[in-house]
């Protein structure tokens, strides 16, 4: 039965004389008069079994003490730590030249754990042990005793076990403690790889290469390897493991992210708190779920807050300039927590009588700088029809708008374009021609661009070539031009006027008055 004593983690004790309860019962030769097992009290008044010999009076001492069989446990090199006290020969009463101040340490490898006798010639000498000057002061009972500590190593060993022997040649010595141990590199976790208990190599310079295995919930980044040095220290860690997604390193383990935390990738990062407006309800989350009404865009990193579509733009102002409209607005009060806000313009052309009957403006309308994806809060819309009702909607959008389309995201304004000069009249006809007059009629312009206030008819004799012309104005779409010369070619132009001004004149209509007092009715532009 052995009591527990604490030693370094990299040492595995095979024998500790101080931990043995009761007698050690090692074999001495000679049986009497040589090594003697003696119990002394330690500082806790606990008996320590020691071996002592002090045959300093007589010459030619050869006293052997052999331990019990010590199992090797797979170790190729073992260490022997001896704590002893050795009397200075000068301090001994009546002693002359027979006294020695050294003893010898031996070992013998054997597969037999029951050898009863000491055969000196079987033993191999490890070293001669002398007391050095570096004493350890140890309390033995109420007395301080100077203890020497010497450590020797032996190897490579190959048999199942071995015996140690101590040869006294005439010293006054007490073996207070004998400990035999081997060194191992203790089980350790380095870079999230576990390396098993590894017995050191056979010689004092050997390095044992050991491959590590990733701890639970981790994966190899590079193959983890370490070297077990002869002194039981792990050396030169190579490679590492990384905690899987949803796990982080804590105390050398990969532990699941706590509730409210997440980790998206296998990295050496720690779990992060769920971004704003998101949550995790389980341990080990690899991402966090967005709160109700919040979303994450496809290209948003898991680390980004969940966001929502923006509210409607504010303070939409319109400025109509004839058939153009300039719109300006303010950013939404709530951008949804995103930076990627942009604006889309929707243009609808609405009937004057029923504003609800609107339809898309079509491709003829132009937008500066653009209709969709506007980054600025203004747009200029051109090529509208004059004197027309338009409704413009400004939509605020961001990267998550598509997940929750909501009318609240737009603001609208309805405008009527200004009256503009009308377009030219497409068709002018001579309805009746006489010697002295021409009756003209025409159609309303294609694009009146407002209320037609009047029409202006310009005419002149063809050979005068507009050097001298006359103007007739009428509110109707027809008029009689009188006071003309017979048999004369006249050129007629008609244009319409709105409050915004005159439109372009129509294409010329050439008409020749008659020579006889009869009517000629024509409907072409060039009646003769």
């Amino acid at each position: 039965v052995t009591g527990s004593r604490v030693y370094p983690a990299n040492e595995v004790t095979l024998l500790d004389s101080r931990s043995v309860q009761g007698e050690l019962g090692w074999i001495a030769s000679p049986l009497e008069g040589g090594w003697e097992e003696v119990s002394i009290m330690d500082e806790k008044n606990t008996p320590i079994r020691t071996y002592q010999v002090c045959n300093v009076m007589e010459p030619s001492q050869n006293n052997w003490l052999r331990t019990d069989w010590i199992t090797r446990e797979g170790a190729q090199r073992v260490y022997i730590e001896i704590k002893f006290t050795l009397r200075d020969c000068n301090s001994l009463p009546g002693v002359m030249g027979t006294c020695k101040e050294t003893f010898n340490l031996y070992y013998y490898e054997s597969d037999n754990d029951k050898e009863r006798f000491i055969r000196e010639n079987q033993f191999v000498k490890i070293d001669t042990i002398a007391a050095d000057e570096s004493f350890t002061q140890v309390d033995i009972g109420d007395r301080i005793m100077k203890l020497n500590t010497e450590i020797r190593d032996v190897g490579p060993l190959s048999k199942k076990g071995f015996y140690l022997a101590f040869q006294d040649v005439g010293a006054c010595i007490a073996l207070v403690s004998v400990r035999v141990f081997y060194k191992k590199c203790p089980l350790t976790v380095r870079n999230l790889a576990q390396f098993p208990d590894t017995i050191t190599g056979a010689d004092t310079s050997s390095l044992v290469e050991v491959r590590g295995s990733c701890v639970n919930n981790s994966e190899e980044k590079d193959v983890p390897k370490m070297y077990c040095g002869a002194d039981g220290e792990w050396l030169v860690p190579i490679g590492n493991c990384l905690c899987n997604a949803g796990h982080e390193e804590r105390s050398g383990e990969c532990q699941a992210c706590k509730i409210g935390y997440y980790k998206a990738l296998s990295t050496d990062a720690t779990c992060a708190k769920c971004p704003p407006h998101s949550y995790s309800v389980w341990e080990g989350a690899t991402s966090c779920t967005c709160d109700r009404g919040f979303f994450r865009a496809d290209n948003d990193a898991a680390s980004m807050p969940c966001t929502r579509p923006p509210s409607a733009p504010l303070n939409l102002i319109s400025n109509v300039n004839e058939t153009s409209v300039n719109l300006e607005w303010s950013s939404p009060q709530n951008t949804g927590g995103r930076q990627d806000i942009s604006y889309n313009v929707v243009c609808k052309k609405c009937g004057a009588g029923d504003p609800s009957k609107c339809r898309p403006c079509g491709s003829g309308v132009h937008y500066t700088p653009q209709q969709n994806g506007l980054k600025t809060t203004k747009v200029s819309i051109t090529d509208l029809l004059a004197h027309t009702n338009y409704t413009f909607e400004i939509w605020a959008v961001n990267g998550v708008s598509k997940y929750n389309p909501n009318p609240d995201q737009s603001v609208s304004v309805t405008v009527t374009t200004n009256q503009a000069a009308p377009s030219s009249i497409a068709l002018v006809q001579a309805k009746e021609v006489t010697r002295y007059s021409v009756a003209l009629a025409w159609l309303e312009p294609d694009r009146p661009n407002g209320v037609i206030l009047e029409y202006e008819v310009k005419y002149y004799e063809k050979d005068q070539n507009e050097r001298s012309y006359r103007i007739v104005r009428t509110a109707a779409r027809n008029t009689d031009i009188k006071g003309l010369n017979p048999l004369t070619s006249y050129v007629f132009h008609v244009r319409a006027r709105t409050a915004a001004g005159y439109g372009d004149f129509s294409e010329p209509l050439e008409v020749t008055t008659n020579t006889v007092p009869s009517r000629i009715i024509g409907d072409g532009a060039n009646s003769t």
């Epitope: 007589e58 009546g94 007395r143 007490a174």
Partner: antibody
Framework: QVQLLQSGAEVKKPGASVKVPCKAS????????MSWVRQAPGQGLEWMGW????????TYAQGFTGRFVFSLDTSVSTAYLQISSLKAEDTAVYYC??????????????WGQGTLVTVSS | EIVLTQSPATLSVSPGERATLSCRAS??????LAWYQQKPGQAPRLLIY???TRATGIPDRFSASGSGTDFTLTISRVEPEDFAVYYC????????FGQGTKVEIK
């Protein structure tokens, strides 16, 4: 058993000599030094010195040189204390004692019963 | 020569009581000190060596401590057979005895 046997009391006249034997038994005589201790009547103990039983080499304490001689006869495992030119102040019990030397310290672990030497005219 | 001074010269105790004897050296003797017991008409008996190691057969009510110049012998519970004279003896440099302490019945 281990024991030291001394001779009986001696009465001597001043100027005479006395040889006190100390016979060892029960152990190897030459393995332990032998010490001599004096105790005058009603007084304390006084260490006189020792002799290496292996080599016969003696060591004398201060005040015990000249008239005092330690000797051996290893063949009969006996140590001797000889005092010459006895004086009245030499009257005392003389003890032989085995010197036990250990790694932890020394001590006189086995004692003879003592020999009373009386010097009187 | 190293002088050992024992105190008190006489210690009166009742059986069962604790007795503490002191021995002081004129210079350090390290742990090289022994204690002896002597009863009237008998040879001394080795009790302690090495300042604190009990000799073979000595009851554990006897204990000793000290190092350097100050040493103590303690009898935890004095028995009737313990009434005697006690001597300390140093073997650090030559050998000398203290003058003794007499433990008598109170």
């Amino acid at each position: 058993q281990v024991q030291l046997l001394q001779s009986g009391a001696e009465v001597k006249k001043p100027g005479a000599s006395v040889k006190v034997p100390c016979k060892a038994s029960g152990y190897t005589f030459t393995s332990y030094a032998m010490s001599w201790v004096r105790q005058a009547p009603g007084q304390g103990l006084e260490w006189m010195g020792w002799i290496n039983t292996n080599t016969g080499n003696p060591t004398y304490a201060q005040g015990f040189t000249g008239r005092f001689v330690f000797s051996l006869d290893t063949s009969v495992s006996t140590a001797y204390l000889q005092i010459s030119s006895l004086k009245a102040e030499d009257t005392a019990v003389y003890y032989c004692a085995r010197v036990r030397t250990t790694p932890y310290g020394d001590g006189m672990d086995v004692w003879g019963q003592g020999t009373l030497v009386t010097v009187s005219s | 020569e190293i002088v050992l001074t024992q105190s008190p010269a006489t210690l009166s105790v009742s059986p069962g009581e604790r007795a503490t004897l002191s021995c002081r050296a004129s210079q350090s003797v390290s742990s090289n000190l022994a204690w002896y017991q002597q009863k009237p008409g008998q040879a001394p008996r080795l009790l302690i060596y090495g300042a604190s190691t009990r000799a073979t057969g000595i009851p554990d009510r006897f204990s000793a401590s000290g190092s350097g110049t100050d040493f103590t012998l303690t009898i935890s519970r004095v028995e009737p057979e313990d009434f005697a004279v006690y001597y300390c003896q140093q073997y650090g440099s030559s050998w000398t005895f203290g003058q003794g302490t007499k433990v008598e019945i109170k």
